[in-house]
């Protein structure tokens, strides 16, 4: 080994070196939280970049760059260090137009803490292992969601566009002429029935067990879907999103009530099956796999 390499190895294995890097990262994180940093922080930024560069140089000199089994770039944790340094120099010396977008990569510096703290490194390692093990469960989840999304698509396509429309139109008005002239929220409220405090027109349906319109209103299929058009089963992708919402139980009762009002109470069976399978079974299966992965990592 050359004297330079010997010195680099000594520095690398020294506990003070790890301590210095850890303190640098934490101080850097504190500086990054500043809203309006003063001008002198620019020099501090250069110091941090210098320390990170020094750390990487020490590692490269001690272990080699990329040829060989235990070299710098063969360790995935060092990829992060390398990216951090590259972006630090890029944002500083190269004019790339939208620098603010590149500046967001400075946040990656905070992730360097993981590679420095051994316990954290183990946990993240376990997390990555669990993600690998999750692939099969994820495939099953996506498959189940896709199947139910297709069923939802067939059962409820267009149903959430059913609205209670005012019967007493002016003599020259028609549904089409009104829809062409509607602009504001007030215009909509003039012709469609809204429950007090509701931001969407009252949903209705054409089956006997679906929601009925109040007197003076008739059920029509027109306009957009509820929640600014985001809640629907009109395409596979929207149906998939709705099913994902059911699986994660994200305000699912609202989707359930909307659909049952538009399609009919019979369709509660669909929701019972989806909640039991998707929300109770699949979510717990995912948790079980993650727990197993952590257990294996600990052993």
């Amino acid at each position: 080994f050359s004297p330079l390499r010997r010195i680099s190895i000594k520095i690398l294995v020294h506990s003070l070196f790890s301590m210095l890097i850890m303190c640098t990262i934490l101080t850097n994180c504190i500086f990054m939280t500043m809203n309006n940093p003063p001008d002198w922080t620019k020099n501090v930024e250069y110091t941090f970049t210098g320390i990170y560069t020094f750390e990487s140089l020490v590692k490269i000199l001690a272990r080699g760059f990329c040829v060989g089994e235990f070299t710098f770039l063969r360790d995935p944790w060092n990829w992060l260090d390398f990216v951090v340094i590259v972006f630090a120099y890029l944002t500083e010396f190269v004019n790339l137009g939208n620098v603010s977008a590149l500046r967001t990569f400075r946040v990656l510096r905070a992730l360097k803490t993981i590679s420095v703290i051994p316990g954290l490194k183990t946990i993240v390692g376990a997390l990555i292992q669990s993600v690998k093990k999750l692939s099969d469960v994820m495939i099953l989840t996506v498959f189940c969601l896709s199947v139910f999304a297709l069923i939802g698509l067939q059962l409820f396509m267009g149903n959430l566009k059913h609205k209670c429309f005012r019967n007493s139109l002016e003599n020259n008005e028609t549904l089409e002429s009104i829809m062409n002239t509607l602009e504001s929220e007030e215009d909509f409220r003039k012709y469609f029935y809204y429950l007090e405090g509701s931001k969407d027109a009252l949903l209705c349906g054409f089956s006997t067990d679906s929601g009925q319109c109040p007197e003076g209103y008739t059920c029509v299929k027109i306009g957009r879907n509820p929640d600014y058009g985001y809640t629907s089963f009109d395409t596979f992708s929207w149906a998939f999103l709705a099913l994902f919402r059911l699986m994660t139980q994200d305000y699912w009762e609202n989707l359930y009530q909307q659909t049952l009002r538009a399609a009919g109470k019979t369709y509660m069976i669909f929701f019972v099956v989806v909640i039991f399978l998707g929300s109770f079974y699949l979510i717990n299966l995912i948790l079980a796999v993650v727990a197993m992965a952590y257990e294996e990592q600990n052993q």
Partner: nanobody, 124 residues
Framework: EVQLVESGGGVVQPGGSLRLSCDAS????????MRWHRQAAGKQREFVAR???????DYADSVKGRFTISRDNAKNTVYLQMNSLRPEDTALYYC??????????????????WGQGTLVTVSS
Amino acid sequence: EVQLVESGGGVVQPGGSLRLSCDASGRILRIGYMRWHRQAAGKQREFVARITDDSATDYADSVKGRFTISRDNAKNTVYLQMNSLRPEDTALYYCEALVTASVRGGSIHSGTYWGQGTLVTVSS
């Protein structure tokens, strides 16, 4: 496809009566309001009467007390009973309805549908 067909028109003497009917056919799920309009030769089309799906009615001032609109929801039909007819009632009578129906591919569509019209002539 939804179709509206008017019938019952014809020639009648002043003071006489006629009953017009309008039949809606197709894969109809719901009919909202149904309206009768008329258009005399060289004139603008004018509203005559309306009936909603909960049977609320409304009439043009010129026919109030003489014409009666009714509907049969089971048959998807609207009727216009015209009594005490006058020469100025001579016109082509159209039926209009707000219909929600199941169209090609099983999707649902709501829209305004019109009939071809039936001619009513009041003359001595």
